[in-house]
Amino acid sequence: WGFKDGIFHNSIWLERAAGVYHREARSGKYKLTYAEAKAVCEFEGGHLATYKQLEAARKIGFHVCAAGWMAKGRVGYPIVKPGPNCGFGKTGIIDYGIRLNRSERWDAYCYNPHAKECGGVFTDPKQIFKSPGFPNEYEDNQICYWHIRLKYGQRIHLSFLDFDLEDDPGCLADYVEIYDSYDDVHGFVGRYCGDELPDDIISTGNVMTLKFLSDASVTAGGFQIKYVAMDPVSKSSQGKNTSTTSTGNKNFLAGRFSHL
């Protein structure tokens, strides 16, 4: 799993990135005129994304196979990974140009810098992830994915700085899940909740995924989770390697399952 030669090796795409998101009409794909697309974005407190904003989002993993209106009457869509069914085998913004007929019907690409976002694709050597709104309590009905991909040969050292999620025996309500892979299917490491700080985790490779989910009731203080890149030369043995399991934390379910 990972990112090689600028290409994702599986299909984890962001639904929202750098403030940009895709919208379609309630009746489905390609039903919005330019004026309607503009209204949809404005209704949500944003505006139509510019070409530059869409490209900035694409660069961090925003990939949608649907043409949509952008600012100034432009139409296009962002492709991260080329494929036979979308984007004519190209990457970048597939650009249909500025449309003379604003009554044509497409989807919409909106930009809202104020929207509370969570998750994303991270390639920095170190970063801190926070639950949305931290240090305030997180909200109900949240779902966030953080996908980490470092250089080949590097590993990821994950440590929990603050941790307070709704506590229940099976961590079925609110939880953080860690995967030793670039998706939330393979390499399951553990599911965490409650207020005990989990042990550090060290990945087996250069990729890792964190998933945060909160249900429809009861919230708590949230979390801060830090990662640092470990170079191949590093002989660091501190922390907990994902290939081992821990029984020390009652709020930790560990193992290598494809699903819980």
């Epitope: 009409a25 309630r26 009746s27 005129t33 309607e36 209204a39 009905n141």
Partner: antibody, heavy 120, light 112 residues
């Protein structure tokens, strides 16, 4: 900012008609539908219907079909609702409200309401 | 028509408390594309309604994060995490999945 300014109170005789107006500003009039809602004290809110100024299309609550006529004047960004054959049951407050039927965001900004009194 | 039933009719709360209002529909509000169109409004005395939440859980522009919506299918909930004096008024739900659009009967939030 988005504003919907409704016409003043109306006093009408039973069996007569009345035409209420809703003048909008602060947004592109033709991109949003205008909904009309009836609010009777103690009986909650009832949706009458909407008109989409872009093409003049309408959608009605069957209960109000034939009783309400919805029109727009795009040059003045104003929507109108004409109510026919009024009875005392129609004495109440009527709101206009902006909506986005094609997106499903529902109804966001509302006018201040127009009070209609039906009395002989 | 989808009949919307709101409970409770009246909700006395102390300032700073959490308030929870329920809205139940006689038919599912999920459309064929999997979207659910359920909104929540607050109508303060002598004012027109103001949109708080659209599509079940999305806060409208400028709405404070003390307000949150949840639910699916036929059962929906509005929560106010820490009630303030300015939150008092009548709350109602509106479904816009089915025509005719239908409103809940309203819940009056008042000081205990």
């Amino acid at each position: 900012q988005v504003q919907l300014q409704q016409s003043g109170p109306e006093l009408v005789k039973p069996g007569a008609s009345v035409k209420l107006s809703c003048k909008t500003s602060g947004y592109t009039f033709t991109s949003y539908d205008i909904n009309w809602v009836k609010q009777r004290p103690g009986q909650g809110l009832e949706w009458i219907g909407w008109i989409y100024p872009s093409d003049g299309s309408t959608k009605f609550n069957e209960k109000f079909k034939g009783m309400a006529t919805l029109t727009v004047d795009t040059s003045s960004s104003t929507a109108y609702m004409e109510l026919h054959s009024l009875t005392s049951e129609d004495s109440t407050v009527y709101f206009c409200a902006r909506g986005l039927w094609y997106y499903g965001g529902g109804v966001d900004y509302w006018g201040q309401g127009t009070s209609v009194t039906v009395s002989s | 028509d989808a009949v919307m039933t709101q409970t409770p009719l009246s909700l006395p709360v102390s300032l700073g408390d959490q308030a929870s209002i329920s809205c139940r529909s006689t038919q599912s509000l999920e459309d064929s594309n999997g979207n659910t169109y359920l909104n929540w409004y607050l109508q303060k005395p002598g004012q027109s309604p103001q949109l708080l939440i659209y599509r079940v859980s999305n806060r409208f522009s400028g709405v404070l994060d003390r307000f949150s919506g949840s639910g699916s299918g036929t059962d929906f909930t509005l929560k106010i995490s820490r009630v303030e004096a300015e939150d008092l008024g009548v709350y109602f739900c509106l479904q816009v999945t089915h025509v005719p659009y239908t409103f809940g009967g309203g819940t009056k939030l008042e000081i205990k």
